[in-house]
Interface confidence: low
């Protein structure tokens, strides 16, 4: 086969139909889409294209200029009357810039063979396109059979002489793709076998997924894969002031479209998304977490003077627990409970109240009962101690009532009902409580425990004792029961308002059993244990006043 190297066809004046064709064609040439990167666009080359034709009388370049006097590179061939045409047009070396799949867009016109007189046997309406890969920019001295055919190109629209007269140019656009490419560049070749063609423009490009910011992640320009069905996974990087739980990824399709986003970036705490960037929260606003969409106004009773705040500072006298979410208003301790009332039943007290007028802005209000036992004479109060029972409990009360049992009878108590909430322990302020003063009812007194013998004679015994430990009211009187030992059914009762008595009319040298009990308005207490004392014989002197064991 003949070599295609070293051949060059000098430009000649083009026939009228080509010029008409160009004028129409130029108006249709549009800018390339953003996902296409041109490797060659014959329309934009200002100087010599450097293409070669073989044989020299085959393809010829038509030198035209556009309205800005920029050259227009058009190649034509129209050897329709001659047989066995084999006209080649070779491009210069085209770098593939790392792309493994490229696209060739041809814009051309083709004469309808039926409109050409006498050439029906030799006229063709197709041409062929080939390519040859090479790392060598000066490697055009190759044989025809080394080129790989891309496709036979046919026109969708051919034109006739009539069209020329009407100046209606039928420009064809055909796109073919080639891949996978493995070398740094390639040559294209166009083979005419006897058609009437004007090759108006050749654009060689690859497709990329253009750099994009999606979900606050930047994805770089990405050249599409070699396979038309291939999806390339591309990692994105988060924009300034953003973070991610799951690294952002997208897939670049063979058509240069971004598909199937995975993961996303979020503006970090203190920043919010605006126009695809992360902007600081302005003073008075905050964002506590990347998972929150936008900055929020500081909640009630809090503020921030800073940009990029992740939380707001509570105003004076307002607080926030560590467990309170930052979106929650700052709160304060509650005011005191109100309208406390008491109901006394012997040694039990039932307290009831209504909630504080100001809960401090919280729902976790509970109540604590402080119990103080007060001495009305000394004006002193002391803690009640552990014997008092609280129903249901003393602290953490949710209901507005409580029952205290096992109180001392006939005793002055002060109960402080304190309202507390989740921030009470954070506040240095005074406790908020309402006081209720109550006096428990009188009850039967406890037993007399401490009895001393006084003067003992042959016919009488004098005794003294202390008031019961728990008088449970005002002692009205004491009842003293005594009998001669082993004569229990024959007893005597003496009543006394004092804590001393003398039992008279007793037998000398006899043992007597004494029991004492006290009475209040609530009734008698139980008798004391038995105390035994012996009258003296007729001859003995009085005994001392020693303590009974």
């Amino acid at each position: 086969p003949a070599s295609l190297a070293g051949c060059y066809s000098a430009p000649r004046r083009a026939p009228l139909w080509t010029c008409l064709l160009l004028c129409a064609a130029l108006r249709t040439l549009l800018a390339s889409p953003s996902n296409e990167v041109n490797l060659l666009d014959s329309r934009t080359v200002m100087g010599d294209l450097g293409w070669i034709a073989f044989p020299k009388n085959g393809w010829e370049e038509i030198g035209e200029v556009d309205e800005n006097y920029a050259p227009i590179h058009t190649y034509q061939v129209c050897k329709v009357m001659e047989q066995n045409q084999n006209n080649w047009l070779l491009t210069s070396w085209i770098s593939n810039e790392g792309a493994s799949r490229i696209f060739i867009e041809l814009k051309f016109t083709l004469r309808d063979c039926n409109s050409l007189p006498g050439g029906l046997g030799t006229c063709k309406e197709t041409f062929n396109m080939y390519y040859f890969e090479s790392d060598d920019q000066n490697g055009r001295n190759i044989k025809e059979n080394q080129y790989i055919k891309i496709d036979t190109i046919a026109a969708d629209e051919s034109f006739t002489e009539l069209d020329l007269g009407d100046r209606v140019m039928k420009l064809n656009t055909e796109v073919r793709d080639v891949g996978p490419l493995s070398k740094k560049g390639f040559y294209l070749a166009f083979q005419d076998v006897g058609a009437c063609i004007a090759l108006v423009s050749v654009r060689v490009y690859y497709k990329k997924c253009p750099s994009v910011v999606r979900h606050l992640a930047v994805f770089p320009d990405t050249i599409t894969g070699a396979d038309s069905s291939q999806l390339l996974e591309v990692s994105g990087s988060c924009v300034n002031h953003s973070v991610t739980d799951e690294p952002p990824k997208m897939h670049c399709s063979a058509e240069g479209e971004w598909l199937v986003p995975i993961g996303k970036c979020m503006c970090k705490a203190g920043y919010e998304e605006k126009n695809g960037t992360c902007q600081v929260c302005r003073p008075g606003f905050f964002k506590a977490s990347p998972h929150i969409q936008s900055c929020g106004k500081c909640p009630p009773h809090s503020y921030t003077h800073e940009e990029a705040s992740t939380s707001c500072v509570c105003e004076k006298d307002y607080f926030r627990r560590e467990s309170d979410p930052p979106t929650m208003a700052c709160t304060r301790p509650p005011s005191a409970p109100r309208n406390a009332i008491s109901n006394v039943n012997e040694t039990s007290v039932f307290l009831e109240w209504i909630p504080p007028a100001d809960t401090g802005g919280r729902k976790d209000v509970s109540y604590y009962i402080a119990c103080k036992k007060c001495n009305s004479h000394a004006g002193v109060c002391e803690e009640c101690g552990g014997h008092v029972r609280y129903l249901p409990r003393q602290s953490g009360l949710k209901n507005t009532s409580v029952m205290m049992v096992d109180l001392l009878a006939h005793t002055n108590y002060t109960f402080e009902i304190e309202a507390v909430n989740g921030v009470s322990d954070l506040s240095p302020g005074a406790r908020q409580y309402v006081s209720v003063n109550v006096t428990t009812n009188q009850a039967a007194p406890s037993p007399v425990t401490n009895v001393k013998k006084g003067k003992i004679a042959k016919n009488s015994i004098s005794l003294s004792w202390q008031e019961p430990d728990r008088p449970n009211g005002i002692i009205l009187e004491y009842e003293i029961k005594y009998f001669e030992k082993d004569q229990e059914t024959s007893y005597t009762i003496i009543k006394s308002k004092e804590t001393t008595i003398t039992a008279e009319g007793l037998k000398p040298a006899s043992v007597y059993v004494f029991q004492i009990r006290a009475r209040t308005a609530a009734g008698y207490g139980v008798f004391s244990r038995r105390f035994e004392f012996e009258t003296t014989p007729v001859f003995a002197a009085s005994s001392d006043q020693s303590q009974i064991p």
Epitope: H305, V313, K316, D317, E322, D425, P428, G429
Partner: antibody, heavy 116, light 108 residues
Framework: QVQLVESGGGLVQPGGSLRLSCAAS????????MSWVRQAPGKGLEWVSA????????YYADSVKGRFTISRDNSKNTLYLQMNSLRAEDTAVYYC?????????WGQGTLVTVSS | SYELIQPPSVSVAPGQTARITCGGS??????VHWYQQKPGQAPVLVVY???DRPSGIPERFSGSNSGNTATLTISRVEAGDEADYYC??????????VFGGRTKVTVL
């Protein structure tokens, strides 16, 4: 009753380090923020550092930031002040204080002298 | 950073009233605490949160706070009130406790 007892003071050369401790008792230590306050001889009170009850937040005066570290061990009811790169102007009595009611309990202080 | 200004000294006759001022920008928006310190002793809180008294502090000690000035008032001054006094606030913009300079109260 509430008691705060500082220890760890003494004489140290410029550039040296000391660690002060403050043992607390008589109150729920982990519920309250704590501070270190110092007083140079014949001078007024100067706040040094503070720490929240949980230990999660710490605060420092500009004069000690980067040199002193406040910490606490709530299991031991103890507050610490690690002092590095000491200077002559750090000479003072160092007090620890609670903030139960804005600093209403103070220790008796421990003297730190920085001198060559 | 936030600054508190106190007079260096205040003199008062026994039984009279002593007033110690503490000046600071918009101090009324802050909680002011007052400390008393006697020679060789640790400071003692005498007023907190502008005007509250801890238990055990006599009613003669009172506080107020308005505008740009907080005031500690000691009425019916006694010889035992002779001491250094300090005001203190928490400055939330710098996250610092701030003490005023000391005021020496002398009972004549």
């Amino acid at each position: 009753q509430v008691q705060l007892v500082e220890s760890g003071g003494g004489l140290v050369q410029p550039g040296g380090s000391l660690r002060l401790s403050c043992a607390a008792s008589g109150f729920t230590f982990s519920s309250y923020a704590m501070s270190w306050v110092r007083q140079a001889p014949g001078k007024g009170l100067e706040w040094v550092s503070a720490i929240s009850g949980s230990g999660g937040s710490t605060y420092y005066a500009d004069s000690v930031k980067g040199r002193f570290t406040i910490s606490r061990d709530n299991s031991k009811n103890t507050l610490y002040l690690q002092m590095n790169s000491l200077r002559a102007e750090d000479t003072a009595v160092y007090y620890c204080a609670t903030h139960a009611a804005a600093g209403d309990y103070w220790g008796q202080g421990t003297l730190v002298t920085v001198s060559s | 950073s936030y600054e508190l200004i106190q007079p260096p000294s205040v003199s008062v006759a026994p039984g009279q009233t002593a007033r110690i001022t503490c000046g600071g920008s918009n101090i009324r928006s802050k909680s002011v605490h007052w400390y008393q310190q006697k020679p060789g002793q640790a400071p003692v809180l005498v007023v907190y949160d502008d005007s509250d008294r801890p238990s055990g502090i006599p009613e003669r000690f009172s506080g107020s706070n308005s505008g740009n000035t907080a005031t500690l008032t000691i009425s019916r001054v006694e010889a035992g009130d002779e001491a250094d006094y300090y005001c203190q606030v928490w400055d939330s913009s710098s996250d610092h406790w701030v003490f005023g300079g000391r005021t020496k109260v002398t009972v004549l």
